[in-house]
């Protein structure tokens, strides 16, 4: 459906505030380090624009697409060249290669000072005094920090951020109220951002089929009494949504995004029994809540698989009429049929699968080649949930801290190249597996892990590919998307590792640890932890050990003496000479 | 959790019958695909039939068609096996099996409990 003019059109379905708000954390999240006075103008400027679109479409400018207008926009910022430095050679390009080049340009580790939580006291009184510009500035910070984060989302964790600071600053005890509050959201966005991030990654990396085929298979395990058909629209109209979003077309994105679930909740009974609470919330609660949704049950009887896939005469007849088509439909059954597996594995069986139909169609008697194909599922499914088993006894064997710092060390010596912080973060995220998966039932553990999995080491591949140190993980990034957890978990130690040479300075503390939170003094010994085995890769599980319960040791009673420096100084340099002696470095 | 019980197995001449049952304990068995497989001596173990949930749809392995019938009663809790026309051949252990999620039924790794096994002895 032409309009005459896409701004107003976009400016009329979504309403003033949605639209502002969208197009601020559009360009947010491509000018990352632009200041918030400059973003809220040239909001403000757009938005006055669109507003005389949609007085008379046929105004001056108005044809133009969304493209050319925001990129226009962006353009004019003063300090481009000197603040971005090459990303201002995009403006010289025409639409659609500008666009492609701001996106290009997205940091998803922006240089930018972390977000210190200001005293409760002086949120509330900068929540009453300008309500508006408080919350626009929650949108900011958020999307320059997490340039893929999903837009329409983002909108509602906005309105969960009001709400919080509507009900708690007029509360008794307004921390008490608003920083647990505040801490879910912050917790639930990291999650939102990386789970996004890995759906943009698999479009941009690897493209619309591989997403598709997750989509398939995702929305199969959820809407398992839906027909074939109804899944292949929605994942059609995902993928809409998705490609835009994670292409910067964010208006278009939260505005099918709506009519997605629009959709959806008009045909629920056709799609899944388990959405009636959500059809009935409001847009945004709506939209997440279908997000969300737990798995219908399975329809009552659902037969073999290997009648339509292995036994029937027709398989390679049906496969080469429309090969997509039918793998779409074998995905479409088997994971119906196993919301107990990770979306990954059953990308991994469909591939198995094309790859045997690839082989024995061509086979003079293709029936004797492709009988056996489930048999090669088998160790495809037992090695996941082996896996699952072992890291689940370890970790409640040693409680998440302890079993974050195993993956530390498993993960060091897999590929030592790669800078501490992100080993840091990226093994503390993997860590997290533990306490979210393993306390559930099986059925729900492999689903619940592999594909957490999936989207942490999805952050060590983008995190890894803005600069790039060991060919071990780029080719774990890229040669197969669903294969990525497998690749990394086959890693041994790199035995080309020259070791880095020991440097007393990054095991000097000093008495600003004693002030640390819990969680920021374990990044700290976790920093240390990481150091150490980049300087003896060869150290043992109970080297290491020994030298970090000495190291906790000694914080600890650094952080009780009356002078704190000096017994960091002096204890520091015994506790150095002792490590040293202990590692044999 | 489910707690599988075989039952009715025995000596039986060739061409013989033998009925085997399978009952559940613990949770429901309607929420589970209901399968049968055997182990001979010597052999590994190997697919011999499975129904759905609901009893609707049946499987057998290429061997078994046309002698044996699976059938199961939800509401008793029990699995059947109907062996008919027996030969030396089907001397084995026979174990029943429950998967909650089964895509394949002559998988057994997509099976979750099983049972201890009976055994059933084809010779004259």
């Known amino acids: 459906d032409a309009h005459k003019s896409e701004v107003a059109h976009r400016f009329k379905d979504l309403g003033e505030e949605n639209f502002k708000a969208l197009v601020l954390i559009a360009f947010a999240q491509y000018l990352q380090q632009c200041p918030f006075e400059d973003h809220v103008k040239l909001v403000n400027e757009v938005t006055e624009f669109a507003k005389t679109c949609v007085a008379d479409e046929s105004a001056e400018n108005c044809d133009k697409s969304l493209h050319t207008l925001f990129g226009d926009k962006l353009c004019t910022v003063a300090t481009l060249r000197e603040t971005y430095g090459e990303m201002a050679d995009c403006c010289a390009k025409q639409e659609p290669e500008r666009n492609e080049c701001f996106l290009q340009h997205k940091d998803d580790n922006p240089n930018l000072p972390r977000l210190v939580r200001p005293e409760v006291d002086v949120m509330c009184t900068a929540f009453h005094d300008n309500e508006e510009t408080f919350l626009k500035k929650y949108l900011y910070e958020i999307a320059r920090r997490h340039p893929y984060f999903y837009a329409p989302e983002l909108l509602f964790f906005a309105k969960r951020y009001k709400a919080a600071f509507t009900e708690c600053c007029q509360a008794a005890d307004k921390a008490a109220c608003l920083l647990p509050k505040l801490d879910e959201l912050r917790d639930e966005g990291k999650a939102s951002s990386a789970k996004q991030r890995l759906k943009c990654a698999s479009l941009q990396k690897f493209g619309e089929r591989a997403f598709k085929a997750w989509a398939v298979a995702r929305l199969s395990q959820r809407f398992p009494k839906a027909e074939f058909a109804e899944v292949s629209k929605l994942v059609t109209d995902l993928t809409k949504v998705h490609t835009e979003c994670c292409h910067g077309d964010l208006l278009e994105c939260a505005d099918d995004r709506a009519d997605l679930a629009k959709y959806i909740c008009e045909n629920q009974d056709s799609i899944s029994s388990k959405l009636k609470e959500c059809c009935e919330k409001p847009l945004l609660e709506k939209s997440h809540c279908i997000a969300e949704v737990e798995n219908d049950e399975m329809p009552a009887d659902l037969p073999s698989l290997a009648a339509d896939f292995v036994e029937s005469k027709d398989v390679c007849k049906n496969y080469a009429e429309a090969k997509d088509v039918f793998l779409g439909m074998f995905l479409y059954e088997y994971a119906r049929r196993h919301p107990d597996y990770s979306v990954v594995l059953l990308l991994r069986l469909a591939k198995t699968y094309e790859t045997t139909l690839e082989k024995c169609c061509a086979a003079a008697d293709p029936h004797e080649c492709y009988a056996k194909v489930f048999d090669e599922f088998k160790p495809l499914v037992e090695e996941p949930q082996n896996l699952i088993k072992q890291n689940c006894e370890l970790f409640e064997q040693l409680g998440e801290y302890k079993f974050q710092n195993a993956l530390l060390v498993r993960y060091t010596k897999k590929v030592p190249q790669v800078s501490t912080p992100t080993l840091v973060e990226v093994s503390r995220n993997l860590g997290k597996v533990g306490s979210k998966c393993c306390k559930h039932p099986e059925a729900k553990r492999m689903p619940c892990a592999e594909d957490y999995l999936s989207v942490v080491l999805n952050q060590l591949c983008v995190l890894h590919e803005k600069t790039p140190v060991s060919d071990r993980v780029t080719k774990c990034c890229t040669e197969s998307l669903v294969n990525r957890r497998p690749c990394f978990s086959a890693l041994e130690v790199d035995e080309t590792y020259v070791p880095k040479e020991f440097n007393a300075e990054t095991f000097t503390f000093h008495a600003d640890i004693c002030t640390l939170s819990e969680k920021e003094r374990q990044i700290k010994k976790q920093t240390a932890l990481v150091e150490l085995v980049k300087h003896k890769p060869k150290a043992t599980k109970e080297q290491l050990k020994a030298v970090m319960d000495d190291f906790a040791a000694f914080v600890e009673k650094c952080c009780k003496a009356d002078d704190k420096e000096t017994c960091f100084a002096e204890e520091g340099k015994k506790l150095v000479a002792a490590s040293q002696a202990a590692l044999g470095l | 959790d489910v707690q599988l019980v075989e039952s009715g197995g025995g000596v039986v001449q060739p061409g013989g019958s033998l009925r085997l049952s399978c009952a559940a304990s613990g949770s429901t068995i309607s929420s589970y695909v209901m399968g049968w497989f055997r182990r001979a001596p010597g052999k590994e173990r190997e697919f011999v039939a499975a129904?759905?949930?609901?009893?609707?749809?049946?499987y057998y392995a290429d061997s078994v068609k046309g002698r044996f019938t699976i059938s199961r009663d939800n509401s008793k809790k029990t699995v059947y096996l109907q062996m008919n026309s027996l030969r030396p051949e089907d001397t084995a252990l026979y174990y029943c099996a429950a998967g909650r999620y089964s895509a394949w039924y002559s998988q057994s790794y997509e099976y979750d409990y099983w049972g201890q096994g009976t055994l059933v002895t084809v010779s004259s």
């Open positions: 129904i759905s949930r609901s009893g609707g749809y049946t």
